[in-house]
């Protein structure tokens, strides 16, 4: 089978500070040295890119400076963290993995992680 399987949790609840973390694990059919990981958000039939990082196996993920994502890698496992989430960002977040080099190229698409974000209640005014 030449398909690459990508596993990610079905559901994650973001913290009260709007931070959600999940693991994206892929079963590599080949010995990849350069991997690209993309987080996609699917709402209805629209798919948008949340963030993306390319890394050399054994090195750290490098997201752009203004990215809302951070992450670390360990073998075929990527630990992803998305920050700054609000209730309106609740949705399905898909992990996409591409083995860019060496040939052949492989694409892996996860089933998605439903991230639930609940905006914190504002603190009540206090006399103290």
């Amino acid at each position: 089978c030449k398909a690459m399987h990508v596993a990610q949790p079905a559901v994650v609840l973001a913290s009260s500070r709007g931070i959600a973390s999940f693991v994206c694990e892929y079963a590599s059919p080949g010995k990849a040295t350069e991997v690209r990981v993309t987080v996609l958000r699917q709402a209805d039939s629209q798919v948008t890119e949340v963030c993306a990082a390319t890394y050399m196996m054994g090195n750290e993920l490098t997201f752009l400076d203004d990215s809302i994502c951070t992450g670390t890698s360990s073998g075929n496992q990527v630990n992803l963290t998305i920050q700054g989430l609000r209730a309106m960002d609740t949705g399905l977040y898909i992990c996409k993995v591409e083995l860019m080099y060496p040939p052949p190229y492989y694409l892996g698409i996860g089933n998605g992680t439903q991230i639930y974000v609940i905006d914190p209640e504002p603190c009540p005014d206090s006399d103290f």
């Epitope: 089978c1 030449k2 398909a3 690459m4 399987h5 059919p29 350069e34 690209r36 993309t38 996609l40 798919v47 948008t48 890119e49 993306a52 898909i94 996409k96 860019m100 080099y101 040939p103 052949p104 190229y105 492989y106 694409l107 892996g108 698409i109």
Partner: antibody
């Protein structure tokens, strides 16, 4: 409007060269992989070449390897295909296509005809 | 290389009838990586189905995809006049990207 527009096709003699261009608009070009696909007259679709987001990685069909070179200029939202040592069997309509976020070719240009004949 | 074989080569159907197109892969293709395209004469291909069964934006629900492993099917439940065209399956899970040879759906 989200679209791809190819140009550069034409008539060329065997052994000649041609450079195709594909102008992208209406989307963030650098966030997508890109492909060239061709279709010989009356035949099916044949994938020709792929280029990664930043242009660092390129893949080619065996039939064009060593003769064709794919490239992109993200600043100009443009994709290119340099075709050298052209053969009669390279005669086809050449399409540029966007590799969608989930993988399929979700956006295609209208195509440009390349005819290789003496 | 994954070879995709489509059948039949030509399908003659009357408008309003159902059309069933087959695509068989030489080795297992993950269902997430199988697409169907429609092409009309003089036009570029148009994405219909991706991930074996998800309809692309703007595609009517008379088009549906199914299958897994090596056998995939595109079904057009009730053929409209504009559906007579050539249909291609494609795998996009690994390089080289490959297409089937196409099935022509013609008016009976």
């Amino acid at each position: 409007e989200v679209q791809l527009v190819e140009s550069g096709g034409g008539l060329v003699k065997p052994g000649g060269s041609l450079r195709l261009s594909c102008a992208a608009s209406g989307f963030t070009f650098s966030s997508y992989t890109m492909h060239w696909v061709r279709q010989a007259p009356g035949k099916g679709l044949e994938w020709v070449s792929f280029i990664s987001y930043d242009g660092n990685y390129k893949y080619y069909a065996d039939s064009v390897k060593g003769r064709f070179t794919i490239s992109r200029d993200n600043a100009k939202n443009s994709l290119y295909l340099q075709m050298n040592s052209l053969r009669a069997e390279d005669t086809a309509v050449y399409y540029c296509a966007r590799g969608g976020h989930l993988g399929p070719f979700d956006l295609w240009g209208q195509g440009t005809m390349v005819t290789v004949s003496s | 290389e994954i070879v995709l074989t489509q059948s039949p080569g030509t399908l003659s159907v009357s408008p309003g009838e159902r059309a069933t197109l087959s695509c068989r892969a030489s080795q297992s293709v993950g269902s997430s990586y199988l697409a169907w395209y429609q092409q009309k004469p003089g036009q570029a291909p148009r994405l219909l189905i991706y991930g074996a069964f998800s309809r692309a934006t703007g595609i009517p629900d008379r088009f549906s995809g199914s299958g897994s492993g090596t056998d995939f099917t595109l079904t057009i439940s009730r053929l409209e006049p504009e559906d007579f065209a050539v249909y291609y399956c494609q795998q996009y899970g690994s390089s080289p990207w490959t297409f089937g040879q196409g099935t022509k759906v013609e008016i009976k």
